[in-house]
Interface confidence: low
Amino acid sequence: EVEKTACPSGKKAREIDESLIFYKKWELEACVDAALLATQMDRVNAIPFTYEQLDVLKHKLDELYPQGYPESVIQHLGYLFLKMSPEDIRKWNVTSLETLKALLEVNKGHEMSPQVATLIDRFVKGRGQLDKDTLDTLTAFYPGYLCSLSPEELSSVPPSSIWAVRPQDLDTCDPRQLDVLYPKARLAFQNMNGSEYFVKIQSFLGGAPTEDLKALSQQNVSMDLATFMKLRTDAVLPLTVAEVQKLLGPHVEGLKAEERHRPVRDWILRQRQDDLDTLGLGLQG
């Protein structure tokens, strides 16, 4: 903690400007008024303060706002945000999406940090749910965001938000997460025509039940093997050979290469050999 010392004559800061970079830590503590700092936070990021100087500025704000910073200050924290601990952030009440964006921008390109995770907690708790604008923002900054949520958290995602999701955003989702997302996607894309619908729903099919796969098999969708291999085993097992052939179209030949892997292996074992032989792939049940 910085010792309380009187500000030298003529050094009292009248505004937050570049001259302050030449102040020693104790001079910043003594000569910069915390209220002035709070009203001119937007200027701090334009000034090349050292990390040690930023520590002093943070200390001044902490003294001024022991219960947590107001949003007017939070929105302009800029690089000072990187100095905040999760404990600091838990005191905040962040409600503006602009504030969230401003702070995510500071952390852009870095891994998700405990600070950012805590910030997102505060924001989503304040809003009561993951609305579309929030989800759009979070997936823009953190593409894998959806797959980082538990199925319980995903249940609060409104179907309208699914439009923002790109296939690569679902790469790390596990089956239980897709179980929650798939019905939302189905609802979101329900008014699209067949081929467009399949393009949109394809990434979510790891959560699809058997009856939906049967329906898709009637629509000449030509599902690729990569998508087929991500389907739920329990959803694939009841499909007939004819239905799988229709579902995969020209990609059906790829079953041979995957015959030892789930769900193909388990599906093959459930079929009659006569039916498998109709595919002409040499699959053995």
Epitope: D121, E152, S156
Partner: nanobody, 124 residues
């Protein structure tokens, strides 16, 4: 209401290992198990480990870092604590805690539901 049930405690020799698990049941839509605390006889309850952010982000007490590993599975809504290289000073009742949120935290005030605890005894 969320119910938390810990299991896996027991008696183990110093240097040994134990694996604790905590399963959540009840209305778990928003709350899920994400932390372990412990309380030794005559001492305050202390933070051990926490997991958040889809299992990618974890936090540990300094005293257990490198020896304990916290993990989580969605399918069973369960949080685990793998404890290796156990020491006599790890002897305590271990409690599982559930809360909302994606950031791991050592702050017990952030957790809304607690399990009954499971006894871990490490003999020298």
């Amino acid at each position: 209401q969320v119910q938390l049930q810990e299991s896996g405690g027991g008696l183990v020799q110093a240097g040994g290992s134990l694996s604790l698990s905590c399963a959540a049941s009840g209305h778990t839509d928003s709350y899920y198990p994400k932390a372990w605390f412990r309380q030794a006889p005559g001492k305050e309850r202390e933070f051990v480990a926490s997991i958040g952010w889809g299992g990618r982000m974890t936090a540990y007490a300094d005293s257990v870092k490198g020896r304990f590993t916290v993990s989580r599975t969605y399918a069973k809504n369960t949080v685990y604590l793998q404890m290796n290289s156990l020491k006599p000073e790890d002897t305590a009742v271990y409690y599982c805690a559930a809360g909302i949120g994606w950031a791991p935290t050592a702050d017990s005030g952030e957790y809304d539901y607690w399990g009954q605890g499971t006894q871990v005894t490490v003999s020298s």
